[in-house]
């Protein structure tokens, strides 16, 4: 039974040229983490292995960057980076649990960036 | 055209190390993490580990971490994969590949350097 | 760590056959699989990765399917270019492991 539950920065906007931390955080469950999918879309961004360590899809590798945690930092925003993201853990024994972010880069640079949380 | 051209084929005493070379041609060497793969004689394959030329961040598989270092020199877009205390039944065709653009699989591979253990 | 059992391990078919041959994971691996296929004194080439997206000009008589422990390489019309030793790989766990291999030879 999946008992754990993925708390996420939810919706958040950014300047455009600026940086912006997409971050996940699996709780309520024992289930050990043994993969974290980042995607846009349908598009994959980065995985994070726990035995592999980080994949960066080489399309996005100077603008992704790995971390904090297992969270992505995405750099140089553009208008066309907002969207959808989603953090998808796989998880043992208890199987995959996915988590959404709303992104919105605005070009003014009254952006307010929504709450964002450290993986302890 | 993407091409990871390796080094000549290597006879060596038992207890030796070999460093066998990987250069790589056809795309951004940085973008792309590097791994080996070993394959004895008449056998399957086994992953080696990764390197990751950007950073030289690595990931070896825990039957060689104690034997294995993989380095790069991004100046002549080159991996190397050095390993020591060579005993016989290290002999086998040693391949780089290319970790895949979605993944940890591998989409180009090396034409394999035969390494000979023997004494 | 998981194991990657392939069947058969070798089989004769011909030319225009179709050929299946099968992966087995010890655990669920959802769809982080590939398919490789190697000749004698060649290095291997990547078919599928992702249990069933075809890689850059592989022809499409190849197909993969299949998802959690139990996957499938499906060869719909035998080629002779297409006698070589197939391997599956776990493309997301460390040590990254590979099938024994089936060698598809001439019947």
């Known amino acids: 039974m999946m008992t754990g539950t993925i708390e996420t920065t939810g919706n958040i906007s950014a300047e455009k040229g600026g940086s912006i931390i997409l971050q996940c955080h699996l709780s309520s469950t024992t289930a050990q983490v043994t993969q974290v999918n980042w995607e846009q879309q349908d598009q994959l961004l980065a995985i994070c292995n726990a035995d592999l360590g980080w994949h960066i899809s080489p399309s996005f590798k100077d603008r992704v960057a790995p971390g904090p945690g297992l969270g992505l930092t995405l750099q140089s925003l553009t208008v066309n980076d907002t969207g959808e993201y989603f953090c998808i853990y796989h998880t043992y024994p208890d199987g995959t649990y996915t988590g959404r972010i709303f992104l919105e880069v605005l070009e003014s640079s009254v952006a307010e960036h929504g709450a964002r949380f450290q993986i302890p | 055209e993407v091409q990871l051209v390796q080094s000549g084929a290597e006879v060596k005493k038992p207890g030796a190390s070999v460093k066998v070379s990987c250069k790589a041609s056809?795309?951004?060497?940085?973008?792309?993490?590097m791994h080996w793969v070993r394959q004895a004689p008449g056998q399957g394959l086994e992953w080696m580990g990764r390197?990751?030329?950007?950073?030289?961040?690595?990931k070896y598989n825990e039957k060689f971490k104690t034997r294995v270092t993989m380095t790069r020199d991004t100046s002549t877009s080159t991996v190397y994969m050095e390993l020591s205390s060579l005993r016989s039944e290290d002999t086998a065709v040693y391949y780089c590949?290319?970790?895949?653009?979605?993944?940890?699989?591998?989409?180009?591979w090396g034409q394999g350097t035969l390494v000979t253990v023997s004494s | 760590d998981i194991q990657m059992t392939q069947s058969p391990s070798s089989l004769s078919a011909s030319v225009g056959d179709r050929v299946t041959i099968t992966c087995r994971a010890s655990?669920?691996?959802?769809?982080?699989l590939a398919w490789y296929q190697q000749k004698p004194g060649k290095a291997p080439k990547l078919l599928i990765y992702n249990a069933r997206t075809l890689a850059e000009g592989v022809p499409s008589r190849f197909s993969g399917s299949g998802s959690g422990t139990d996957f499938t390489l499906t060869i719909s019309s035998l080629q002779p270019e297409d006698f070589a030793t197939y391997y599956c790989q776990y493309h997301s766990g460390s040590p990254l492991p590979f099938g024994g291999g089936t060698k598809v030879e001439i019947k």
């Open positions: 655990e669920n691996i959802y769809s982080y």
């Open positions: 390197i990751d030329p950007d950073s030289t961040g690595s």
């Open positions: 056809g795309y951004t060497f940085t973008n792309y993490w």
């Open positions: 590949a290319r970790e895949g653009a979605y993944g940890y699989y591998f989409d180009y």
